[in-house]
């Protein structure tokens, strides 16, 4: 029997300090550019080497950004989201959603939380 793929979704608050070259990442998504089917949210598409986000290490490509400095990113045009980041100031607080892929084995397979015997 084949295993199935599940996702573990977690949220995290990430505080970044804008570096010399900015925050150091790219985004996709928005109401005019759905990146994920039926989801107009904003997603991290690239983390730039040696940028603030990369040096911090917590933000990952594929993360969904839920808010910036407390401002919700729902129902924003792509460029409006970009502008929000650019105008976010020196200290930037991001609420992000990580989506980790978890490979589950066939039924009866011992889970990670089970005793190893």
């Amino acid at each position: 029997m084949n295993g199935r793929v599940d996702y573990l979704v977690t949220e995290e608050e990430i505080n970044l300090t804008r570096g010399p070259s900015g925050l150091g990442f790219n985004i996709v998504g928005g109401t005019d550019q759905q990146y994920v089917s039926n989801d107009s949210g904003i997603y991290v598409s690239r983390i730039k080497e040696n940028g603030a986000a990369a040096l911090d290490g917590r933000l990952q490509e594929g993360d969904k950004i839920l808010s910036v400095n407390g401002q919700d990113l729902k129902n924003l045009l792509h460029q409006d989201a970009v502008d929000l980041f650019r105008n976010a100031g020196y200290a930037v607080s991001l609420r992000v959603q990580h989506r980790l892929q978890v490979q589950n084995g066939p039924i009866g397979h011992r889970g990670e939380g089970d005793p190893s015997g």
Partner: nanobody
Framework: EVQLVESGGGLVQPGGSVRVSCVSS????????IGWFRQAPGKEREGVSC???????YYVDSVKGRFTISRDNAKNTVYLQMNSLKPEDTAVYYC????????????????????WGQGTQVTVS
């Protein structure tokens, strides 16, 4: 493997026109920002025009009204139509691609791009 290949350059008379193309392979163009840059002998590479992932176009002041950028995602191709060419437009023209929009700088900033083509020479003489 991500690849960008420019074509369509050549020798053109002042006041003439030329269209250069950038064909991408190894990725789907849809969510990519594409920029055109040029480098004249002895000068730094400069941004000419770019088009973001939702089709918004940007131009450096010196080419506004003369150059037009467009994209055909179905053909994985971005075009730069250059009209009313001047001798100072002579340069090697490069296209570049970046996945998504930088939250830090406009797409005319060459430091934001991850992928570059080899360039095509345009000579106005």
């Amino acid at each position: 493997e991500v690849q960008l290949v420019e074509s369509g350059g050549g020798l053109v008379q002042p006041g003439g026109s030329v269209r250069v193309s950038c064909v991408s392979s190894g990725f789907i163009l849809d969510y990519y920002v594409i920029g055109w840059f040029r480098q004249a002998p002895g000068k730094e590479r400069e941004g000419v025009s770019c088009i973001d992932s939702v089709g918004r176009a940007y131009y450096v002041d010196s080419v506004k009204g003369r150059f037009t950028i467009s994209r055909d995602n179905a053909k994985n191709t971005v075009y730069l139509q250059m009209n009313s060419l001047k001798p100072e437009d002579t340069a090697v023209y490069y296209c570049a691609a970046d996945f998504g929009s930088s939250v830090d700088s406009t797409c005319l900033n060459n430091q934001q791009y991850d992928y570059w083509g080899q360039g095509t020479q345009v000579t106005v003489s």
